[in-house]
């Protein structure tokens, strides 16, 4: 009967308990990007700071080569913000020239790569037409949601145009995930 | 051998277990702001409702004088949305007058103050150029991410222009944090 | 004395411990919407995919008839993104006609329905004026925050104009909640 006093707190537990501070977590922050040649319809992936300033990875969540590597299966909350900035969008140039108004756009995609799958899976997308009148424009796209991930899955953030990403401040453009 | 049946659920625990309902949490909602004279390049902080309507603080997470006070060290998810609204932005007035297009902007910053640090740390920033053509414009900026905080840290939300914050509804402008 | 070795990890626990993987969670994704007649000032609710693709419900969190049903009381993080798209907004047509500039708007509301309350409660609202110059425009509104919910509460996502919702991709428009 000795251990019985602990029983009430275990009666509704169907999986092993684990301390919250022991869960895989990461918050990555922006760095200057290397321009990359990418195929049409294939957005380039951002790379990230993982240990300096506000950035960290912990509890076996590792960052390598643009990817966050998921160390254990479970439900994760994944989020990212990308701040874009540019000079007068093509859309307004087109408008001035009296041609049809096909707006520019900015897009962020959080993508999951599973080695056993041939195709990456798009988990989250934020996409916005940009048809600004001012000469300089800037704006963030924020994304966040919960997904069931498997050990070994890899996460990355892709953008429509790497040259428009504001890489100047760690609080403007970031990427993170944590096991729930 | 009596207590042995509970051992498996403790083998992977490296920190004390704790009930989730016992963790510091807060969701604060907008109230009418007091206009403040503020120095150039120093954004004013918003103050918040902490107990009426949807707002609450619990488990030693306290709100005082525009700050959320962090009661224990750990990883927190922090979020805020600020809805801005305005009458025709200066940008469109400048455009009509034929002068150069310097857009207005709206900015939200979630800031951490640590008493032992001389300078506040900007954790999250959402900033957007505003160059609206319509006479009335309104739009939200949302932010959210995870940070490692220390007991005694203080969090606040700063904005570029307090007079543009929509203070009318608790679901439009809010600020929250919870220990993971 | 046998069970004593586990005592330290229980000293700060004031509520039953429970495994994280056992908590109510849902991530719902967009499907094509059925246009609905709705009363003025009453925004239509979206319906959702709950089991195919990225969508899931688990641990007694059920989806039925546009609602997420909360199976147990506690603090939940609730989020949604709705991507809107449209052809030239009325605002720019009005502008061209030289009439006053009343901007169109797009709005997302996450609403809580409690059977014992006569009126639904608006938990989160994202609202944005749309006064686009380009012929096609598209943009997301993201919302997320923590709320104390009661067993039996129901959550839905309402939008200002169901015909403007981008239902084409599960990563563009989604709705989720999880017990903290």
């Amino acid at each position: 009967l000795k251990g019985q006093e602990f029983a009430p707190s275990h009666q509704q537990v169907y999986a092993p308990l684990r301390a919250d501070g022991d869960k895989p977590r990461a918050h990555l922050t922006v760095v200057r990007q290397t321009p990359t040649q990418h195929f049409k319809n294939q957005f380039p992936a951002l790379h990230w700071e993982h240990e300096l300033g506000l950035a960290f990875t912990k509890n076996r969540m590792n960052y390598t080569n643009k990817f966050l590597l998921i160390p254990e299966s479970g439900d994760y909350f994944i989020y990212s913000q990308v701040t874009f900035r540019g000079m007068t969008s093509e859309c307004s140039e087109i408008r001035q020239a009296g041609r049809p108004n096909k707006p520019d756009s900015i897009t962020v995609v959080i993508t999951k790569v599973t080695d056993s799958y041939p195709e990456p899976t798009q988990l989250l997308m934020g996409t916005k037409s940009v048809c600004e009148v001012g000469s300089n424009w800037f704006q963030p796209i924020y994304l966040g949601a919960m997904f069931s991930l498997q050990e070994g899955d890899k996460l990355m953030v892709n953008v429509s145009d790497i040259s428009l990403v504001d890489y100047t401040k760690e609080d403007k453009t970031f990427f993170g995930a944590f096991l729930l | 051998l009596k207590g042995q049946e509970f051992a498996p659920s403790h083998q992977q625990v490296y920190a004390p277990l704790r009930a989730d309902g016992d963790k510091p949490r807060a969701h604060l909602t907008v109230v009418r702001q007091t206009p403040t004279q503020h120095f150039k390049n120093q954004f004013p902080a918003l103050h918040w409702e902490h107990e009426l309507g949807l707002a609450f603080t619990k488990n030693r997470m306290n709100y005082t004088n525009k700050f959320l006070l962090i009661p224990e060290s750990g990883d927190y998810f922090i979020y805020s949305q600020v809805t801005f609204r305005g009458m025709t932005s200066e940008c469109s007035e400048i455009r009509q007058a034929g002068r150069p297009n310097k857009p207005d902007s709206i900015t939200v910053v979630i800031t951490k103050v640590t008493d032992s640090y001389p300078e506040p740390t900007q954790l999250l920033m959402g900033t957007k150029s505003v160059c609206e053509v319509g006479s009335n414009w309104f739009q939200p900026i949302y932010l959210g991410a995870m940070f490692s905080l220390q007991e005694g840290d203080k969090l606040m939300v700063n904005v570029s222009d307090i007079s543009l914050v929509d203070y009318t509804k608790e679901d439009k402008t809010f600020f929250g944090a919870f220990l993971l | 004395l046998k069970g004593q070795e586990f005592a330290p990890s229980h000293q700060q626990v004031y509520a039953p411990l429970r495994a994280d993987g056992d908590k109510p969670r849902a991530h719902l994704t967009v499907v094509r919407q059925t246009p609905t007649q709705h009363f003025k000032n009453q925004f239509p609710a979206l319906h959702w995919e709950h089991e195919l693709g990225l969508a899931f419900t688990k641990n007694r969190m059920n989806y039925t008839n546009k609602f997420l049903l909360i199976p147990e009381s506690g603090d939940y993080f609730i989020y949604s993104q709705v991507t809107f798209r449209g052809m030239t907004s009325e605002c720019s047509e009005i502008r061209q006609a030289g009439r006053p500039n009343k901007p169109d708007s797009i709005t997302v509301v996450i609403t809580k329905v409690t059977d014992s309350y006569p009126e639904p409660t608006q938990l989160l609202m994202g609202t944005k004026s749309v006064c686009e110059v380009g012929s096609n425009w598209f943009q997301p509104i993201y919302l997320g925050a923590m709320f104390s919910l009661q067993e039996g509460d129901k959550l839905m996502v309402n939008v200002s104009d169901i015909s403007l919702v981008d239902y084409t991709k599960e990563d563009k428009t989604f709705f989720g909640a999880f017990l903290l």
Partner: antibody, heavy 118, light 109 residues
Framework: QVQLQQWGAGLLKPSETLSLTCAVY????????WSWIRQPPGKGLEWIGE???????NYKPSLKSRVTISVDTSKNQFSLKLSSVTAADTALYYC????????????WGQGTMVTVSS | DIQMTQSPSSLSASVGDRVTITCRAS??????LNWYQQRPGKAPNLLLF???SLQSGVPSRFSGSGSGTDFTLTINSLQPEDFATYYC???????????FGQGTKLEIK
């Protein structure tokens, strides 16, 4: 079209409590701040206090000890109570809605004349 | 307290005239200033808010300007219905202790 309709006792004796109610018709009650404002005969306007959408009140400091503003959201009504009235409280009392631009009152009740006399 | 001083306290004008009413704050109130019109026996009517923003439904002959401590209300081409009392109101302090000016009575000449 949003309208405010107000009512309450018009004649009070000194030391009594003034009580007025304002009903909101034809529009949303939530999402606005609701104020009481008064105007003594032949004089200017004086803001008394307000209640916000979640029930938080804010009062003119010099009247704070005597004022209570409350709300009944189920009826779309809000009320003013002013205790221990004197002749100086004789005024035309208005309820009003803040348009969301910091104490700019865009919709007003018709006014209720309250006279304090022994 | 922020004191609001309107001038003149009264003025006479004719239909079609352009009139200007000024309002001075005892300290910087940025653009936190509103203007109201009150006709005899009626509730006040909001004309302009945040110094220069025209309230919906108000004729465009009404305009406002100013920032800081000095503000003006201008009525272009006076109409018969414009003869009334006008109040400025500072909305900078929270709560507003002394928010309204003493009024300017606009009379027909």
């Amino acid at each position: 079209q949003v309208q405010l309709q107000q009512w309450g006792a018009g004649l009070l004796k000194p030391s009594e409590t003034l009580s007025l109610t304002c009903a909101v018709y034809g529009g949303s009650f939530s999402g606005y701040y609701w104020s009481w404002i008064r105007q003594p005969p032949g004089k200017g306007l004086e803001w008394i206090g307000e209640i916000n959408p979640v029930g938080r009140t804010n009062y003119k400091p010099s009247l704070k000890s005597r004022v209570t503003i409350s709300v009944d959201t189920s009826k779309n009504q809000f009320s003013l109570k002013l205790s221990s009235v004197t002749a100086a409280d004789t005024a035309l009392y208005y309820c009003a809605r803040d348009n969301g631009w910091h104490y700019a009152f865009d919709i007003w009740g018709q006014g209720t004349m309250v006279t304090v006399s022994s | 307290d922020i004191q609001m001083t309107q001038s003149p306290s009264s003025l006479s004008a004719s239909v079609g005239d352009r009139v200007t009413i000024t309002c001075r704050a005892s300290q910087n109130i940025s653009s936190y200033l509103n203007w109201y019109q009150q006709r005899p026996g009626k509730a006040p009517n909001l004309l302009l808010f945040t110094a220069s923003s025209l309230q919906s439904g108000v004729p465009s002959r009404f305009s406002g300007s100013g920032s800081g401590t000095d503000f003006t209300l201008t009525i272009n081409s006076l109409q018969p219905e414009d003869f009334a009392t006008y109040y400025c109101q500072q909305s900078y302090s929270n709560p507003p202790e002394s928010s309204f000016g003493q009024g300017t009575k606009l009379e027909i000449k």
